[in-house]
Amino acid sequence: ARNGDHCPLGPGRCCRLHTVRASLEDLGWADWVLSPREVQVTMCIGACPSQFRAANMHAQIKTSLHRLKPDTVPAPCCVPASYNPMVLIQKTDTGVSLQTYDDLLAKDCHCI
Amino acid sequence: ARNGDHCPLGPGRCCRLHTVRASLEDLGWADWVLSPREVQVTMCIGACPSQFRAANMHAQIKTSLHRLKPDTVPAPCCVPASYNPMVLIQKTDTGVSLQTYDDLLAKDCHCI
């Protein structure tokens, strides 16, 4: 774990990378993707307590204002900081093609 | 309005730019900022229903999986797509200085 990654809410409760298994049907891809038949989707899930994995100044301000005005300003949100590429084998009119998608799988998470 | 900007939840309920007025005291800046005395903090607030302002393919996947597994996968979240710089006037030992902060005010929002 990186510095500042201690979760005050308890282990695993704060913003971090999770893996969710999904079929092509789950994703609505069955008509246009041949492979993989199942995708290990990595995504960012969890709470963003004060200053935890704060992405930038805006996230830090959001924390301060959320404390003051919780009904108006939401807490920062756990989102991808970067992505891993994924190759999909797709059906085409002439056969198949390999396509790389750069913004599909979360690689790292932060709060913003 | 951009494509995908129609909010199915009603006007102003979906992810968009809001302005929250905050004093230097609210932000914890009173000791180190001379001006402005009050900041119009622009931030991204609102719901992210299906495909609304989806930032990328990851956001689209998240929407699909949230529909299937709402207890496991959260809905996409409304966050800044870009920022506006802000100039703060600060006291210094020799007078005052103007400092620019780049990632402080949200300029545009999307769902991720």
Partner: nanobody
Framework: QVQLVESGGGLVQPGGSLRLSCAAS????????MSWYRQAPGKERALVAY???????YHIDSVKGRFTISRNNAENTVYLQMNSLKPEDTAVYYC??????WGQGTQVTVSS
């Protein structure tokens, strides 16, 4: 992700010197106003000095000419060089990034 760790405090005789360090992680100090505060027993935490992103510094009157704040962007570390220490400088010294993040503090005791 945002973390500040102070070190360098200790017991020193009046007239002596100490150099406090504040190691930052999870953000780049170069773009922040980095500050040192202190809290004496029974008193509120109060500003001692800060350094702006552009480099200009500010020191409170009671430490001017004795204390100097500086930073090393490459090491992501902020320093407070304290010379000609007085008993009234006794306090816990905290490093802050101006946006709500604080270190755990380092104790400075000036006594003969």
């Amino acid at each position: 992700q945002v973390q500040l760790v102070e070190s360098g405090g200790g017991l020193v005789q009046p007239g002596g010197s100490l150099r406090l360090s504040c190691a930052a992680s999870g953000f780049t100090i170069r773009t922040y106003t980095m500050s040192w505060y202190r809290q004496a027993p029974g008193k509120e935490r109060a500003l001692v000095a800060y350094i702006t992103p552009g480099g200009p510094t500010y020191h409170i009157d009671s430490v001017k000419g004795r204390f100097t704040i500086s930073r090393n962007n490459a090491e992501n570390t902020v320093y407070l060089q304290m010379n000609s220490l007085k008993p009234e400088d006794t306090a816990v010294y905290y490093c802050g990034n101006g946006f709500g993040s604080w270190g755990q503090g380092t104790q400075v005791t000036v006594s003969s």
